[in-house]
Amino acid sequence: MAMVSEFLKQAWFIENEEQEYVQTVKSSKG
């Protein structure tokens, strides 16, 4: 169970970081 929650924590953070970076790039181009 701890392994599952650790995986989810990493996946959530990585997904958030990706989305935030995409937004940053879009706003700098726009």
Partner: antibody
Framework: EVQLLESGGGLVQPGGSLRLSCAAS????????MSWVRQAPGKGLEWVSA????????YYADSVKGRFTISRDNSKNTLYLQMNSLRAEDTAVYYC?????????WGQGTLVTVSS | QSVLTQPPSASGTPGQRVTISCTGS????????VTWYQQLPGTAPKLLIY???HRPSGVPDRFSGSKSGTSASLAISGLQSEDEADYYC???????????FGGGTKLTVLG
Amino acid sequence: EVQLLESGGGLVQPGGSLRLSCAASGFTFSNYAMSWVRQAPGKGLEWVSAIYPGGGSIYYADSVKGRFTISRDNSKNTLYLQMNSLRAEDTAVYYCARRLQIFDYWGQGTLVTVSS
Amino acid sequence: QSVLTQPPSASGTPGQRVTISCTGSSSNIGSNNVTWYQQLPGTAPKLLIYSDSHRPSGVPDRFSGSKSGTSASLAISGLQSEDEADYYCGSWDYSLSAYVFGGGTKLTVLG
């Protein structure tokens, strides 16, 4: 302008310790995960460690686990890497980089030489 | 031995198209996005491609990335002498709870 400036490298004997610092400016440091990446002379890149924005999660490469400690002081906009029990194979240029896995900004690096 | 596998070297002449491969597994490339970095001689690495195929602002559209399953590729078209550099792929690995790099590919522009 985003800037990352590493310091603290130098020559150290095997078994010794060193603390690297990375001073960040030009962005809201406390909002970002930060990482350390190293490169041995003439070799490829090796990820060393990463820390979440608030310091709540920390990750290490197996090669440094139990010997290196990453930390950050968000009030000083500074990232640290405490390196203990240093070995010859830790000799490398150490870079700090912004983010956990899209390293969009890198410092210029600081050279750590482990030799007797 | 790197977790992600890249050819150690690649070469091409000016104007040519060159591709660099990066092979991983289900715990890294298979489940996470791939990033590519360019390292010019004597300098720090620079972000080249993120999220498998996206270019940051300032990176020429001659550089493109793609991914299929557990492998990724970097393509450079219209090769120029200033493209001579080391190229690294990277991805987060869920099994290792660590970021992993490929061993790097040294690109030589001939002639």
